[in-house]
Interface confidence: low
């Protein structure tokens, strides 16, 4: 392919040319390329207009290209470029106009590029820049140059892993000129030892991240004091597990935060055993969101009412015991992936709406009611990936719940009462892999608003799916995979008229039945993969609901034997619904194992008597049918011949064609023959058939009996149309009954031989007879019309006044 | 397959091979070398990743004397405010890091331990590297 050795990811759009030892920019990629990855190639030098071949580029990755010099206008033609990545290039020389022409650049990544100063970085004209990442460089001064006042769209500035030690008042002066800037600033992993008090006074930042910046507790305290006056939406402090950490840490560390205005606070990774971590947060009582990530909290008093937090997040922390939570204003609590404190203890959170307690290995003695959480406002509850949860209450006081997730926890007492009876507002329920054994038909009673139900990986009494969904009239998604199901009630899904997706995969069904799905008139996706389906339950399978768009029957145990031939044929008939048909393979018999079901032609062997009787029967029936068929048309055509025998032919030719070729018939055939000299009169069904008369009768009486000849317009559409083939077959009979009749074949377009062979007679006739081929060129058209007129004039008595036919006693006419 | 030796300790010998086509160079040092009876030390890694390390996780396939243990997924980088500083490393950026480790009180029986480490990162997820570690364990006492 033209783009090789690069990889085409999205045709004409995305190309991956990573690590191909290119020394220059490739020139064999399309002009339309938008995403280009040239990383890990030894390009070394970028001259002017290096990328003129790619005017549409939006993303350009030049990571680790050993680039040392970038000349003026290297990217000059890239006015659409939004992302430029230069990570890991040892840049020695950067021309002042290196980034000129990048009028749409939003993201510039210059990580590990030997950058020693922002002052000399020529990006002042990049007004559209939103993200500047200059981490892992040699920058010593935090002075933001004057040109930053042009970067009015800047949202992210990453200066982490540099050499910044001090921050002075003058360093941030430019930010005072940009009060509307919504800047997130990352200064992590800089060896800070001094922040001048007042440096951040009256400065607004969206986010400030300071992790692993201080080599002692005193330095940390002093620097935090230096942040006084800062207004920050989100402040992230902490350390990294794999970097040098402070020797000690105590409750005075964060005292300086009282002088900041903070909306959201996060402490990320802190591995110290503190007497009582709560004392650390005296200056953070009024933040709206408070997060602890990977913090050791061995001993903790209660998180109590005097905190005004609305969102509390405790993630990946180590606890001695489950904390006591009494927070009046808290609306969201995320307590996930924590260790220790395995038993859930009641909390008192009267305003709580969102509660995520997932992945803690917690056990609940009795779940769930308002008293567990001290709230009646809860809308979202996630208890997934926990330990044993014993259901002892049906969510009394928690009627507002809309989202409930228990997946991969071990639910007990689920089939003893209607657990969800009061949850009439619940929209989403996940009880997948919860060791639930459904033995009670009222398990889902009360869930009248439920739209999504996931219950994969559970089990049912006797592996039978009963009528447990009767109240779930609004359900749109149902997952019953991996439930060891073998049978289902024929009416199990009758009330689910809104259901769109049904997953029945990974069960133990041996047969398929369409009956249970008859009421699912919104069903779009049905997944029956990974079962043991061999055959159908009933002899006659009906159709699935007409809304169905995807049917997955992959990885089943299809029995490709004569016994199941009707089922296999039914599967073939569903071809347009089936997904991944190549993974639908025969399981038995052994000689057909692994063969694709849809490409299989089963020739069925039966005993000789049955074959003999069958063949004889078929022959007799066939002969009778053929005789009746021939006799019927013989009589009809004969009757017509007697009726019209003494009269004149009204038409010179009856035209048989597919309605999809009507444009050609109207614009070419009719125009040239009826308006030409001599004029021919054609019989056309859209114009000359009598309304209200049966089509077959019209074809015979109006078409054949009143026409001298028949013109057959052969095309792909013609061969695929049953009506056309029907008309053509009558034409054959007509030719057979009236030896002088002439059929003129016009081949309108090259017809695929395989398609033509399906109509054996037509194939033979076209092989034996000369036919006219339509060719849309000046010379071709001329020859075509001359030959067609000649064929139609044959047997025609012409006078300029009108068209006179020769009646039923036609003269001999050659077929062309 | 070329075998890369890591280190020898009093009760173990550790080496690895690549189990992917890419075989991008990675330098692994353990100091002191791991002793399976109890160990504390530093793991030093030098590596230039071919994709961002954001959302890095390992799939671990452990075999003990030809017996396969269930696949284990170890999430290293969640995607924001991660524990390790290398989680913010970008494609092509040098990762040069030291990680401390310690474990104690685990009794391992004599034999050959294999651990396939599949590192997966990024969005969309793709394989970063794949290494197969072989630990030959010869305990002094069982």
């Amino acid at each position: 392919e033209s783009w090789e050795p690069c990889v085409e990811v999205v045709p004409n759009i995305t190309y991956q040319c990573m690590e191909l030892n290119f020394y220059k920019i490739p020139d064999n990629l399309p002009f339309s390329t938008k995403n280009l990855d040239l990383s890990f190639n030894p390009l070394r030098h970028l001259g002017s207009y290096s990328f003129f071949s790619f005017p549409e580029l939006q993303v350009l990755d030049l990571s680790r290209c050993e680039i040392q010099t970038i000349e003026d206008g290297a990217y000059q033609s890239l006015s659409h470029l939004s992302t430029l990545i230069l990570t890991g290039n040892p840049i020695q020389s950067l021309a002042l106009g290196a980034f000129s022409g990048l009028s749409s650049l939003q993201k510039l990544v210059a990580v590990e590029t030997n950058l020693a100063s922002l002052e000399n970085f020529p990006i002042g004209h990049l007004k559209t820049l939103k993200e500047l990442n200059v981490a892992h460089n040699l920058i010593q001064s935090f002075k933001l140059p004057e040109y930053f006042s042009n970067l009015t769209n800047l949202e992210h500035l990453d200066l982490s892993s540099n050499k910044i030690q001090s921050i002075y008042c003058t360093d941030l002066r430019v930010l005072h000129q940009m009060p509307l800037l919504n800047l997130s600033l990352d200064l992590s992993l800089n060896p800070m030892n001094f922040i001048q008090p007042g440096a951040f006074k009256e400065i607004r930042l969206h986010k400030l991240t300071l992790r692993n910046n201080f080599d002692s507790l005193n330095v940390m305290k002093t620097c935090i004091q230096g942040l006084a006056g800062l207004e920050v939406h989100r402040l992230v402090l902490g350390e990294f597990r794999n970097e040098g950490n402070l020797e000690k840490f105590d409750k005075s560390a964060l005292e300086g935060l009282c002088n900041l205005t903070i909306e959201e606070f996060r402490l990320a990774y802190l591995d110290y055993y503190l007497d009582d971590i709560i004392d650390l947060f005296n200056c953070l009582t009024n933040v709206s969101s408070f997060s602890l990530v990977s913090v050791t909290i061995e001993r903790v008093k209660d998180f109590s009412y005097n905190f005004g937090w609305q969102h509390l997040e405790l993630v990946n922390c180590k606890f001695g015991q489950f904390p006591t939570l009494k927070l009046k204003s808290l609306k969201r609590l995320t307590f996930t992936s924590n260790k220790g404190g395995n038993a859930f203890s009641e909390v008192d959170l009267p305003s709580l709406e969102f509660l995520d307690l997932s992945r803690n290995g917690l056990s609940f003695k009795g779940c769930c009611s308002q008293s567990d959480f001290g709230t009646t406002s809860l809308k979202y509850l996630d208890l997934s990936f926990n330990g044993v949860i014993t259901m002892s209450s049906n969510f009394l006081g928690l009627e507002q719940l809309e989202h409930l997730d228990f997946q991969h926890s071990n639910l007990k007492q689920m089939s003893e009462f209607s657990v969800f009876l009061s949850l009439r507002n619940l929209i989403y329920l996940d009880i997948s892999h919860t060791h639930t054994r459904v033995a009670f038909n009222g398990i889902f009673n009360g869930l009248s608003s439920l739209e999504v139900l996931k219950m994969a990986g559970n089990s049912f009494q006797e592996n039978f799916l009963p009528d447990i969904f009767t109240e779930l009239r609004n359900l749109t998604f149902l997952d019953l995979s991996q439930c060891q199901l073998e049978q289902l009630s024929p009416t199990a899904f009758n009330s689910l008229s809104s259901l769109q997706v049904l997953n029945m995969s990974h069960n133990n069904f041996f047969s398929l039945d369409t009956f249970p799905y008859k009421c699912l008139n919104s069903l779009q996706v049905l997944d029956y993969s990974l079962n043991h389906i061999m055959t159908s339950k009933k002899q006659e399978l009906q159709h699935f609901p007409s809304s169905l768009a995807f049917l997955n029957l992959t990885q089943n145990d299809f029995a490709c034997t004569c016994e199941h031939q009707s089922f296999l044929q039914w599967i073939k008939d569903q071809r347009q619904l089936l997904v991944e048909v190549e993974r639908m393979e025969c399981a038995t018999p052994s000689d057909k194992q692994g063969m694709p079901v849809l490409s299989l032609n089963i020739t069925c062997q039966m005993n000789k008597t049955i074959i003999g009787v069958s063949v004889l029967s078929v022959l007799v029936v066939s002969v009778v049918a053929v005789l009746v068929y021939k006799f019927y048309f013989h009589l009809m055509l004969l009757a017509g011949c007697i009726k019209y025998g003494r009269g004149e032919n009204i038409y010179d030719a009856f035209v048989i064609y597919s309605s999809q070729d009507e444009d050609w018939v109207r614009n070419e055939l009719v125009k040239n023959l009826e308006e030409g000299v001599p004029p021919f009169q054609l019989c056309l069904h859209y114009r000359d058939f009598i309304p209200g008369v049966a089509i077959a009768a019209n074809i015979i009486h109006e078409g054949f009996h009143k026409s001298r000849k028949v013109i057959v317009v052969v095309s792909q559409h013609f061969i695929q149309s049953r009506w056309c083939i029907f008309e053509y077959e009558i034409a054959q009979t007509w030719q057979f009954l009236s030896s002088r009749a002439g059929i003129i074949f016009i081949v309108l377009q090259k017809v695929e031989k395989t398609l033509l062979r399906q109509q054996v007679e037509l194939y033979r006739l076209l092989s034996r007879n000369t036919y006219l081929e339509w060719e849309d060129s000046v010379l071709g058209r001329h020859i075509f019309w001359r030959r067609l007129r000649k064929a139609l004039l044959d047997g025609k008595s012409w006078n300029p006044e009108g068209t006179v036919g020769t009646g039923c006693n036609w003269q001999e006419a050659t077929s062309i | 397959q070329k075998q890369y030796w890591v280190c020898n300790s009093s009760d173990a010998s550790i080496s690895y091979t690549y189990c992917d086509k890419m075989q991008y160079p990675i330098s692994i040092n353990v100091n002191p070398c791991i002793e399976l009876k109890r160990s504390k030390g530093l793991l030093h890694i030098f590596y230039i990743p071919r994709r961002d390390l954001k959302q890095l996780y390992f799939n671990l396939y452990i075999t003990v004397n030809t017996m396969n243990l269930p696949k284990r997924k170890e999430v290293i980088c969640r995607g924001s405010d991660d524990d390790y500083s290398f989680c913010r490393a970008l494609k092509g950026e040098t990762v040069n890091t030291t990680i401390s480790f310690s474990f104690k009180g685990i009794k391992f029986s004599k034999g050959k331990y294999k651990c396939v480490v599949e590192a997966i990162s990024g969005s969309p997820e793709e394989m970063l590297f794949c290494l197969e570690f072989v630990i030959l364990h010869q305990p002094n006492s069982n």
Epitope: I427, Y428, S449, E451, V452, N474, T476, F477, S498, Q500, V501, S522, Q524, V525, S547, A549, F550, V579 | S123, P124
Partner: antibody, heavy 120, light 106 residues
Framework: QVQLQQSGADLVRPGALVKLSCTAS????????IHWVKKRPEWGLEWIGW????????IYDPRFQGKASITADTSSNTAFLQLTSLTSEDTAVYYC?????????????WGQGTTVTVSS | QIVLTQSPSIMSASLGEEITLTCSAS?????MHWYQQKSGTSPKLLIY???NLASGVPSRFSGSGSGTFYSLTISSVEAEDAADYYC?????????FGGGTKLEIK
């Protein structure tokens, strides 16, 4: 942050076809549905269909069946809309939008729109 | 398919006024989403699932309704609320939008 970046405007001839792209950033398209919506001047919004990139499913409004084809490439986090046999009726702004969290949430983020003009 | 009819098709309101836009469905739907589209911009999610406010949407917007009748209320109209408003159902296939209500500020 979550963004959907659509391809630029297209001027196409009647009878031709056009393929629009929608590149997502800030989230993985495998975790959501990507919808396509049509907006003609002086008309309201018309839903064309959605794709579920994780399961490689696409569903269409019957009015657009045969006219539209929605696909996704999860490796580049991009969804595509291909329109065939274009007529003046297809002149419109086409938006892609994220349908969040499975089958029941609304379209919470939209692309900036791609203007398709069908003209000879 | 379910047809959503929005009324009025054009509405004029004064600053500070409370207004209600309605959307009726040809047959019952489970819930309704509402979108706002200002001139020359993409639509923006306003209300999801009948009454939930999308993030960043001012609290002056509220939604209600059930069955075949749904409404969007703006408690105190501001100049920036001038836009087209569309209701949208995603509970019955194919998913449909209303014809829209154009809100003009006097």
């Amino acid at each position: 942050q979550v963004q959907l970046q659509q391809s630029g405007a297209d001027l196409v001839r009647p009878g031709a076809l056009v393929k629009l792209s929608c590149t997502a950033s800030g989230f993985n398209i495998k975790d959501s549905y990507i919808h396509w919506v049509k907006k003609r001047p002086e008309w309201g919004l018309e839903w064309i269909g959605w794709t579920d990139p994780e399961n490689v499913n696409s569903i269409y409004d019957p009015r657009f069946q045969g006219k539209a084809s929605i696909t996704a490439d999860t490796s580049s986090n991009t969804a595509f809309l291909q329109l065939t046999s274009l007529t003046s009726e297809d002149t419109a702004v086409y938006y892609c939008a994220r349908g969040y969290n499975g089958v029941y949430y609304a379209m919470d983020y939209w692309g900036q729109g791609t203007t398709v003009t069908v003209s000879s | 398919q379910i047809v959503l009819t929005q009324s009025p098709s054009i509405m004029s309101a004064s600053l500070g006024e409370e207004i209600t836009l309605t959307c009726s469905a040809s047959s019952s739907v489970i819930y309704m989403h509402w979108y706002q589209q200002k001139s020359g911009t993409s639509p923006k999610l306003l209300i999801y699932r009948t009454y939930n406010l999308a993030s960043g949407v001012p609290s002056r917007f509220s939604g209600s309704g059930s069955g075949t009748f749904y409404s969007l209320t703006i408690s105190s109209v501001e100049a920036e609320d001038a836009a087209d408003y569309y209701c949208h159902q995603w509970s019955s296939f194919p998913y449909t939008f209303g014809g829209g209500t154009k809100l003009e500020i006097k």
